[in-house]
Interface confidence: low
């Protein structure tokens, strides 16, 4: 018969003739031959292949640097690669994360919308009439202005998107 | 420019503890990591651990079940305890510090100390 | 872990040649490569980090490279103030681990 020039799902051409690959946590060690299977080896400690492959070496699993802020958010498998995370105050700069940058504060004025996470940073928005603050934060949100009414008492210094209303007594009518 | 200054005894005696500190100056004690690195005489150094600015620690195994690396940021300082101390403990002991997401190395050291253990 | 394995031990040149100093990795360390000199009685120095770059202040006769497995210093056209121990050191991998050291000394 013709020698295949194409081959099945999970397999691949070589020297003519069709070798399964090797599925995925596990590395080629050598291909099939007339009267041999395609031989392949699990990926060692710390190594891993996520594909069915013809792969000679495993990947090494991303070491998630401690140096860099990063820390271990899901240990990589035979079949999986590590994913890093940023420790607790730091966000990833970038998808891949291979390094930490600081979460952003709000300024006054400005409160948070959504807080930082490990991938992503702090969302900043403005503190709208009727809210302030007076902080630069992570965390903090805009507070809304005290309610000088619900205290029996009335405005006395209106309040801003950095400060807070200022209440006082009202004025007593003398008799 | 972060200086790092260090203290303590020079001397100890074996099953003993190790105890040395580090005190940061010319910089904040935050954003960085501290490490804790042995060279014994006349031979290469050895990375013992360290402490990064959120105070988790990282150990070299071949260390870690006597290794304590802590730090006192008030005091602006970090401190090396090396449990039931050998002969084979002996060293100049340094500290040394980087910045976390600079991806370089030790950028500072601290002046070193020489550390004997003898009865 | 990694071990680091430097030669030669020892180098002995004249002030003004070059130094050629290799540093090789028993696994790819990428190209997270330090290089620190130490002096007699002192904190060894950061010179090289990432292979390649120069740490601040260290003079443009010192240079770093390769990748992988395989790392060179060079320093150009030694001064006095070279001669010195210099070690190289990875951080790909955990635990960082140093190199055993080479000892560059006057001829």
């Known amino acids: 018969p013709e020698p295949p020039t194409a081959c099945r799902e999970k397999q691949y051409l070589i020297n003519s003739q069709c070798c399964s690959l090797c599925q995925p946590g596990q590395k080629l060690v050598s291909d099939c031959t007339e009267f041999t299977e395609t031989e392949c080896l699990p990926c060692g400690e710390s190594e891993f292949l996520d594909t069915w492959n013809r792969e000679t070496h495993c990947h090494q699993h991303k070491y998630c640097d401690p140096n860099l802020g990063l820390r271990v958010q899901q240990k990589g498998t035979s079949e999986t690669d590590t994913i890093c995370t940023c420790e607790e105050g730091w966000h990833c700069t970038s998808e891949a994360c291979e390094s930490c940058v600081l979460h952003r504060s709000c300024s006054p004025g400005f409160g948070v919308k959504q807080i930082a996470t490990g991938v992503s940073d702090t969302i900043c928005e403005p503190c709208p009439v009727g809210f302030f603050s007076n902080v630069s934060s992570a965390f903090e949100k805009c507070h809304p202005w005290t309610s000088c009414e619900t205290k029996d008492l009335v405005v006395q210094q209106a309040g801003t998107n950095k400060t807070d209303v200022v209440c006082g007594p009202q004025d007593r009518l003398r008799a | 420019q972060v200086q790092l200054v260090q203290s303590g005894p020079g001397l100890v005696k074996p099953s003993e503890t190790l105890s040395l500190t580090c005190t940061v100056s010319g910089g904040s004690i935050s954003y960085y990591y501290w490490s804790w690195i042995r060279q014994p005489p006349g031979k290469g150094l050895e990375w013992i651990g360290h402490?990064?600015?959120?105070?988790?620690?990282n150990y070299n195994p071949s260390l870690k079940s006597r290794v304590t690396i802590s730090e006192d940021t008030s005091k602006k300082q970090f401190s090396l305890k090396l449990d039931s101390v050998t002969a084979a403990d002996t060293a100049v002991y340094y500290c040394?510090?980087?910045?976390?997401?600079?991806?370089?190395?030790?950028?500072?050291w601290g002046q070193g100390t020489l550390v004997t253990v003898s009865s | 872990e990694i071990v680091m394995t430097q030669s030669p031990a020892t180098l002995s040149l004249s002030p003004g040649e070059r130094a050629t100093l290799s540093c090789r990795a028993s696994?790819?360390?990428?190209?997270?490569l330090a290089w620190y000199q130490q002096k007699p009685g002192q904190a060894p120095r950061l010179l090289i980090y990432d292979a390649s770059n120069r740490a601040a202040d260290i003079p443009a006769r010192f240079s770093g490279s390769g990748s992988g497995t395989d790392f060179t210093l060079t320093i150009s056209s030694l001064e006095p103030e070279d001669f010195a121990v210099y070690y190289c050191?990875?951080?790909?991998?955990?635990?960082?681990?140093f190199g055993q050291g080479t000892k560059v000394e006057i001829k």
């Open positions: 050191q990875q951080r790909n991998n955990w635990p960082p681990t």
């Open positions: 040394a510090g980087g910045i976390v997401g600079a991806r370089r190395g030790f950028d500072f």
């Open positions: 696994q790819s360390v990428s190209n997270n």
């Open positions: 402490i990064s600015y959120s105070g988790s620690t």
